[in-house]
Interface confidence: low
C-alpha cells in the first residue's frame, strides 16, 4: 500500500533550488529500481516533477496561495519489467501554506461621511472595512486591526469593527467644518511585523441650530416721506446667523414701540432681511418720529441648545417722517380726446383739471409741454385747462397727437405735475381716390372685342367708417367713340375691355385712356388717372412679341381715337 500523508508546501519560496515537496513511496518498493513512480494531475510535469525511481516530488516554480491554495494530483507505481501497477492509482493533495504576503486593503480609497456638529462623544460616523487576501483560517495573517493615524482627538476608531465615532465634545461646525481622518488597517492582529494599508475619511460636520441670529448694530434709522403709501418699503435690516440653511433662516417681527400699528416688518425669505414697510398712512403734522423694537428669531430651534440662551435678538428702529409738499394731482391718469380733421383754428377739444392736494390748495396754472408739441398745433387756457387747436389738422399726416400737459402751482412753480393727452384726429373725406400704381398695358393687334386687358385698383388716404367704395368710368371727353370700355367691378376694382375686333399699330401705336375714380363719401372726391395702352404684335397665345419702340410713359392727355 501507499505510504504518505498530506503534503504541505510554503508559498512564495525564494530559494535557488527546487522546493522539496515530499516523497511518494510504496511498501512494495525494495529499493532495487524495479518500480517506476508516475505523477499526474494539477501541475504535474510543469509545477511539480517526480523522480521516477525514488518518488521524490519537487516544485519547480514559486507558488502563490492566494492564486491557488490546493493542488490535487494522482500517483501511480508500476513494475518496470511488466508495466503493471503494483499499487492502485491514488489521489493526493498538496496544500499551499500561507505566509503574510498581503496587506489589508480598504474597500474605498476615500470615504466621505457627515455627522452633526455638537454630537455626543461616541456618536457613530461611518464604518470603514479593509480586507486581507491572506488565509483567515491559519495564523493572524488576515486578522485586521484598525487604528487612527490622523484625526485625534476629534475622532476614534473601534479596533475590531472599523467603526469611527466622535471623540470630542462640542465640535463646532462654525469653528471647523471639515476633518480629514486617516485610518490604518494592520494585519497580524496589529502586532510588530504586520502589513498595513490606510484610507482617508473626509468628515463634514453638518449644521445644527446652535447659533442665534445677531443684529450687527443695536439701532437703525430710516427716513420716509409722509406721502409713502401703505406697503412702501422704508429700509432693510439684517441679522446674521453663523448657522446655514434652515438653521440660519430668520423671521422678523415688531414687538414693541409707538410705531407698532403704523409699520410692518416683512421677512424676505430669499435675502433673509427684514423689510420695514408702511402699514398706515403717515402724517408729518401729527407725528414726526417713531421708534420700533424689532426682533429677529430662528423659526426652528432645537430644545437641547436652549441652554445657550434665547435664539433671538432685538434692535431699535427709529423712523423719521419727512414733510412733503405735494404737486398738483390731475383728475385722470391720462386724457383721451378727439377732434375732426377739418376743425378750424381755436376749436375747443376738451379740458383737463388738476388740484393741489395740500391743505393750502394753491391755485394751479396749465401749460403744454412744448417738447411734446413742437409744431404748436395745440394750446391750453392756462386758467381753466381748456385745450384748443392753434393750427389746422390733417388725419392723413398724423392720426394721434400725444402731448403732455403740465399743471404748476402758481405760488410754488417747483411743484408741477404732468399728464398725457392722447388726441385722436377723426377722418373727413378730404382726399380723392387714385390709381394704386402707374398702369401701362398692351393690346394685341388681333384682339377680339370685350377682351379684358387690364384690371385697375385704387387707393384713398382717407379712412371712412364704412370702408372704401370706389367707382370707375371713362372721362366724359373720352367716353364717346372710345376704342375701349371701363367695366366697374363694384369691388373697388375695374377692368379695361377692348371695344372692337382688331387694332392696327401702324395706324395708332398708343392709346391714352383717362379714367375717373370717385369715392362714395361726403363730400365726394374724384380724380382722373391715365392708362397707357400700347398696340403690339402677339403670338397665337396672346403673348406680346413686338411693339413700336416709343416712350413707355406718356404725359397725361388723350390720344385721338382713344
Amino acid at each position: 500500500s501507499w505510504m504518505w500523508n498530506q503534503f504541505f508546501l510554503l508559498e512564495e519560496y525564494t530559494g535557488s533550488d527546487y522546493q522539496y515537496v515530499g516523497k511518494l513511496h510504496s511498501d512494495q518498493d525494495r529499493g532495487d529500481g524495479s518500480l517506476k513512480y508516475i505523477l499526474s494531475g494539477d501541475g504535474a510535469g510543469d509545477l511539480f516533477i517526480i523522480n521516477e525511481n525514488t518518488g521524490d516530488i519537487q516544485a519547480t516554480k514559486r507558488l502563490d496561495r492566494e492564486e491557488k491554495p490546493v493542488y490535487i494530483l494522482r500517483a501511480q507505481a508500476i513494475n518496470r519489467r511488466t508495466g503493471r501497477p503494483v499499487e492502485p492509482e491514488s489521489e493526493f493533495i498538496i496544500k499551499i501554506h500561507d505566509i503574510n504576503d498581503n496587506e489589508p486593503i480598504f474597500t474605498k480609497e476615500v470615504y466621505t461621511a457627515t455627522v452633526p456638529e455638537m454630537s455626543d462623544v461616541g456618536t457613530f460616523v461611518v464604518q470603514v472595512t479593509a480586507t486581507d487576501a491572506d488565509d483567515p483560517t491559519y495564523g493572524n495573517s488576515a486578522k485586521v486591526v484598525y487604528s487612527i493615524l490622523q484625526g485625534q482627538p476629534y475622532f476614534s476608531v473601534e479596533s475590531e469593527t472599523g467603526i469611527i465615532k466622535t471623540a470630542l465634545l462640542n465640535m463646532d461646525r462654525e469653528n471647523r467644518e471639515q476633518y480629514q481622518v486617516v485610518i490604518q488597517a494592520k494585519d497580524m492582529g496589529g502586532q510588530m511585523g504586520g502589513l498595513s494599508g490606510t484610507t482617508t475619511v473626509n468628515i463634514t460636520l453638518t449644521d445644527v441650530n446652535d447659533n442665534p441670529p445677531r443684529f450687527p448694530q443695536s439701532t437703525y434709522q430710516f427716513k420716509t416721506p409722509e406721502s409713502s403709501p401703505p406697503g412702501t418699503p422704508i429700509g432693510r435690516i439684517k441679522a446674521s446667523d453663523a448657522d446655514v440653511g434652515e438653521n440660519a433662516e430668520i423671521e422678523y417681527s415688531i414687538t414693541d414701540g409707538e410705531g407698532l400699528d403704523m409699520f410692518d416688518v416683512i421677512t424676505d425669505q430669499e435675502t433673509q432681511e427684514g423689510i420695514i414697510t408702511v402699514k398706515k398712512l403717515l402724517d408729518f403734522e401729527k407725528k414726526k418720529v417713531y421708534t420700533l423694537k424689532v426682533e429677529a428669531s430662528n423659526p426652528y430651534v432645537e430644545p437641547r441648545f436652549l441652554y445657550l440662551g434665547p435664539f433671538k435678538d432685538s434692535a431699535t428702529v427709529r423712523i423719521v417722517v419727512e414733510d412733503v409738499d405735494e404737486p398738483p394731482v390731475f383728475s385722470k391718469l391720462a386724457y383721451i380726446l378727439q377732434i375732426r380733421e377739418d376743425a378750424q383754428i381755436n376749436t375747443t377739444i376738451g379740458s383737463v383739471t388738476a388740484q393741489d392736494p395740500d391743505a393750502a390748495r394753491n391755485p394751479v396754472k396749465y401749460s403744454v409741454d412744448r417738447h411734446t408739441d413742437m409744431d404748436r398745433i395745440f394750446n391750453i387756457d392756462s386758467g381753466n385747462g381748456s385745450i384748443f387747436t392753434s393750427k389746422l389738422l390733417d388725419r392723413e399726416t398724423l392720426l394721434w397727437h400725444n402731448i403732455t400737459v403740465i399743471a404748476t402751482e402758481i405760488n410754488n412753480p417747483k411743484q408741477s405735475s404732468r399728464v398725457p393727452l392722447y388726441i385722436k384726429v377723426l377722418d373727413v373725406n378730404d382726399n380723392a381716390p387714385e390709381f394704386a400704381e402707374f398702369y401701362e398695358t398692351f393690346v394685341c393687334e388681333k384682339a377680339k372685342a370685350d377682351q379684358l386687358i387690364q384690371t385697375l385698383h385704387a387707393v384713398d388716404k382717407d379712412d371712412p367708417y364704412s370702408g372704401h367704395q370706389f367707382s370707375f368710368s371713362l372721362a366724359p371727353e373720352a367716353a364717346s367713340g372710345s376704342n375701349f370700355t371701363i367695366q366697374d367691378n363694384k369691388d373697388n376694382t375695374a377692368g379695361i375691355l377692348t371695344r372692337k375686333n382688331g387694332y392696327n399699330r401702324h395706324e395708332m401705336s398708343t392709346y391714352l385712356l383717362p379714367v375717373v375714380i370717385s369715392d362714395n363719401d361726403y363730400p365726394v372726391q374724384s380724380s382722373t388717372g391715365t392708362v397707357t395702352v400700347r398696340v403690339c404684335a402677339c403670338d397665337h397665345h396672346g403673348n406680346m412679341q413686338s411693339c413700336h419702340a416709343e416712350a413707355l410713359i406718356h404725359p397725361t392727355g388723350l390720344s385721338t381715337g382713344a
Epitope: T114, T204, A239, V244, G245, I250, T271, Q272
Partner: antibody, heavy 121, light 107 residues
Framework: EVQLQESGPGLVKPSQSLSLTCSVT????????WGWIRKFPGNKMEWMGY???????SYNPSLKSRMSITRDASKNQFFLQLNSVTTDDTATYYC???????????????WGPGTMVTVSS | DVQMTQSPSYLAASPGESVSISCKAT??????LAWYQQKPGEAYKVLIY???TLQSGTPSRFSGSGSGTDFTLTIRSLEPEDFGLYSC?????????FGSGTKLEIK
C-alpha cells in the same frame, strides 16, 4: 477644495432646449446655494438663478418663464434647462457656489471654468 | 433691477503702479457688493465681498471701499499676475446684477 465643472452641448439649434450639467466635487450640494450665471459676447453678465441646499429654486424674472434648475443630490450634480432658445442665448455659461452661511451673502465664492454655448441653425 | 455701471472698461498699467476701478449702482445697495477677477483660461475668483472684506486668499494689495451707490476697487503696486478681467456684482436684491467688466492689461 470645491471644484465645479459645466458640461453640455456646445451647439444648440434655435427654438430647441439647452441643457447643461454642473458636476460638483469636494463639497455636497445639499449645503449652500448653487447658481447659474452666463456671460454674453462683450462681457455682459447675467445671473440666471439658483437651487438651494434643500432644492428650493429662484430665477431671474427675465428668464423665469423658460428656464428650470434641478439637481441629483446622489450624483452631486445640478442642471440647467433653458427652453425656446434664440441666437441671443449664445453665451458662456457658468455654475457657481454661493456661501450664504450667514444669511443673504449672494456672491459666488467658487466658479466653474464655464462652457461656451452657441445657438445657431 | 439695480443697474451696475463699471468704469473704465479698459485699463493699461505697468507692474508697480496703483490702479482704481469704479462701480456705480442706480440705487443704494448698502455694502452688498462683491468684486471678481478672471484670468484668461481660468475660473472667476471672488476677491472682495461686503464692499471691503477681503476673501480668504486675496492679497492685501487689493482693497475695496464705498457704500450706497459708489464703490471702488484699488490695487496697489500691481503684480504681473493681477492682469485680467475685473467685475463687480450687487447682491442687495434680486435679480443679482453685474458690472460690464474692466479689462486690466500690461502697458
Amino acid at each position: 477644495e470645491v471644484q465645479l465643472q459645466e458640461s453640455g452641448p456646445g451647439l444648440v439649434k434655435p427654438s430647441q432646449s439647452l441643457s447643461l450639467t454642473c458636476s460638483v466635487t469636494g463639497y455636497s450640494i445639499t449645503t449652500y446655494y448653487w447658481g447659474w450665471i452666463r456671460k454674453f459676447p462683450g462681457n455682459k453678465m447675467e445671473w440666471m438663478g439658483y437651487i438651494s441646499y434643500s432644492g428650493r429654486t429662484s430665477y431671474n424674472p427675465s428668464l423665469k418663464s423658460r428656464m428650470s434648475i434641478t439637481r441629483d443630490a446622489s450624483k452631486n450634480q445640478f442642471f440647467l434647462q433653458l427652453n425656446s432658445v434664440t441666437t441671443d442665448d449664445t453665451a458662456t455659461y457658468y455654475c457657481a457656489r454661493s456661501p450664504i452661511n450667514h444669511g443673504g451673502y449672494w456672491y459666488f465664492d467658487f466658479w466653474g471654468p464655464g462652457t461656451m454655448v452657441t445657438v445657431s441653425s | 433691477d439695480v443697474q451696475m455701471t463699471q468704469s473704465p472698461s479698459y485699463l493699461a498699467a505697468s507692474p508697480g503702479e496703483s490702479v482704481s476701478i469704479s462701480c456705480k449702482a442706480t440705487k443704494s445697495i448698502s455694502n452688498y457688493l462683491a468684486w471678481y477677477q478672471q484670468k484668461p483660461g481660468e475660473a472667476y475668483k471672488v476677491l472682495i465681498y461686503s464692499g471691503s472684506t477681503l476673501q480668504s486668499g486675496t492679497p492685501s494689495r487689493f482693497s475695496g471701499s464705498g457704500s450706497g451707490t459708489d464703490f471702488t476697487l484699488t490695487i496697489r503696486s500691481l503684480e504681473p499676475e493681477d492682469f485680467g478681467l475685473y467685475s463687480c456684482q450687487q447682491y442687495y436684491e434680486k435679480p443679482l446684477t453685474f458690472g460690464s467688466g474692466t479689462k486690466l492689461e500690461i502697458k
